[in-house]
Amino acid sequence: KSSNEATNITPKHNMKAFLDELKAENIKKFLYNFTQIPHLAGTEQNFQLAKQIQSQWKEFGLDSVELAHYDVLLSYPNKTHPNYISIINEDGNEIFNTSLFEPPPPGYENVSDIVPPFSAFSPQGMPEGDLVYVNYARTEDFFKLERDMKINCSGKIVIARYGKVFRGNKVKNAQLAGAKGVILYSDPADYFAPGVKSYPDGWNLPGGGVQRGNILNLNGAGDPLTPGYPANEYAYRRGIAEAVGLPSIPVHPIGYYDAQKLLEKMGGSAPPDSSWRGSLKVPYNVGPGFTGNFSTQKVKMHIHSTNEVTRIYNVIGTLRGAVEPDRYVILGGHRDSWVFGGIDPQSGAAVVHEIVRSFGTLKKEGWRPRRTILFASWDAEEFGLLGSTEWAEENSRLLQERGVAYINADSSIEGNYTLRVDCTPLMYSLVHNLTKELKSPDEGFEGKSLYESWTKKSPSPEFSGMPRISKLGSGNDFEVFFQRLGIASGRARYTKNWETNKFSGYPLYHSVYETYELVEKFYDPMFKYHLTVAQVRGGMVFELANSIVLPFDCRDYAVVLRKYADKIYSISMKHPQEMKTYSVSFDSLFSAVKNFTEIASKFSERLQDFDKSNPIVLRMMNDQLMFLERAFIDPLGLPDRPFYRHVIYAPSSHNKYAGESFPGIYDALFDIESKVDPSKAWGEVKRQIYVAAFTVQAAAETLSEVA
């Protein structure tokens, strides 16, 4: 059968029908429904929501909707023994204690089961000692402290401001520096936009607001007790001492009112420069310890959280493909939230719900997609991407053979300024072409395309007249699909005009104030940005599932490979003496990129010319496109990170949220001047160049004529 026979409707009409069926009012209703009570992973409330979504997806018309459950390690505060931080005097008396909960927002005073702010997976402990302020606790912040300022964090409790990098990296850095505890806080410089009121009168963080979040360093492992395998009924679980990625020191988050009380007494060294100062009326002294009058006072942490193996539930919906049912296009986003999830995740889940409803409406009218579409409502994303990772581990053999693409659907908005897209280069042209067909929701761009407003507000730094598309990092549910399995992936959402604050999140991120009203009053009253994101995510899924030839352009991979090779070369050449001494050559990598470019170009020519009515040849060409992303996977993984297997992209070793290109070479070069054995270090650089060059060449050969 041709695609059009199978689907009963002409392709253009299909896409238009699908997009026209998406309604802002429905997304609004779904968001309201999903945000009235907390849906913390592992709780009864989140199980009930899973069953509700299962039931509604069935009503919408999906062929099947199943729950997939796993028993994974989660973390909760002790209900009778709360976590807090004290300032203690020389007699050990607590003269100041941090708050035990966030003041609830108006209308939510009587809601039960609001989990108090905590750092998920913190070990228990009651360390006490002097405080050291470590700025954002980034790698470079600890370099500044230890190397330039000669400040030793060993045996100290460090206080770090949230922002710039994933909180788990902050904790890892503090551990490596010898700290015995970590206090995380939200500084107004990062979480209070000038000229905006704090919630409930605006979208800024109030002084009592606190960001929850996990502090794991899983590196893609999923459930800490069952790395590489699903946490099913017969799973063998590691002992807690062998669990992957757990922090070894107590950690706790606080708001800026409480942070003020700790930081105002700080003594010791002055901040090294203005980049270490936030917006509180405190000196931002680094320490260690408190100033003169308060020098005998110490800080004490009281952490009593517990790690518990708990059942979680994914919802998996299937819309069977009419022509290629064994090719899967996946749309997935998480359902679990820290509290109400007004933005994270329910602004995304509401969009997925409306996309499912629209697809279901078309199916009821007799249409089917060419390829199978899988819809997923993931559980326990907030606890380390656990639901998506366990499901992918359970289904890895199917996914690696049949997975065409994965589109992520967490928060639809983190602002209302312009579109933000992170994706594989294979999807660049798909995103460009789709956004040219969609209307911009932006003020001042009436009658203009989304592509036009996006390009104007977020231009590409390299190509004029094109929008910025970023590399995929991690910190969301696409991780296992892209970084471990090599399935082409992408994500899209509306964002803020705040490039310098890219990884800090919106002010109320993971706080109790992330409510339906936050979205409805301040971010998107008409839900027009949500609708646009639904059109982008849904449109991508539609095209990936329905186009006769997969909408992947391998030439765009060639362009970025050359750019990434140039960048890593320039980093390496900053060490010319060692490059010369150890005769480090990039010939193999540049040669491989050249070959990839030529072969991709020839493949694209053949793609234009082949007989699309021949189903065997069509399937062959599509398989070459589908498997190209897979060809960048190294089965051995990256050094010390076996579940990050993509050779071109990995989450940065210094910030899980950010993507790094040629990560193996990058990490081998990082801080290489401090390595004790330069010969060994430069040998590893050469090995990583070899691995990268081989992988690029091998990937190129998958695009060559098959015989």
């Epitope: 390299e462 362009v559 050359r562 750019k563 090779a565 140039d566 960048k567 070369y569 320039s570 390496s572 050449m573 010319p576 060692e578 490059m579 010369k580 001494t581 150890y582 005769s583 480090v584 050559s585 990039f586 010939d587 540049f590 040669s591 990129v593 050249k594």
Partner: nanobody
Framework: EVQLVESGGGLVQPGGSLRLSCTVS????????VSWVRQAPGQGLEWVSA???????YYADSVKGRFTISRDNSKNTLYLQMNSLRAEDTAVYYC??????WGQGTLVTVSS
């Protein structure tokens, strides 16, 4: 055999300009990133600038805003335009493909 041959060095006064060239052979120039590296008298090697196969440019902080790297793929030639020269720019300037392939260098002396 890979060859890189620098030219254009010489004596120039502080504040003056100079343009270095590097003609290459033995490899497909357009497909490779190339660099300028210098060595001041009695000092180690210092990376100055690189230009990628894609044309992207990279500079050491010490020369940013004063030096411009460029390439002409049709002539297999790499250039370094050096403006606002200072005494501390005095060095032998090498054209380098990577750690394995280097030119012989050309001397730049900045002195009044």
């Amino acid at each position: 055999e890979v060859q890189l041959v620098e030219s254009g060095g010489g004596l120039v006064q502080p504040g003056g300009s100079l343009r270095l060239s590097c003609t290459v052979s033995g490899f497909t120039f357009s497909s490779y990133a190339v660099s300028w590296v210098r060595q001041a008298p009695g000092q180690g090697l210092e990376w100055v600038s690189a230009i990628g196969a894609g044309g992207g440019t990279y500079y050491a902080d010490s020369v940013k805003g004063r030096f411009t790297i460029s390439r002409d793929n049709s002539k297999n030639t790499l250039y370094l335009q050096m403006n606002s020269l200072r005494a501390e720019d005095t060095a032998v300037y090498y054209c380098a493909k990577d750690g394995a392939d280097w030119g012989q260098g050309t001397l730049v002396t900045v002195s009044s």
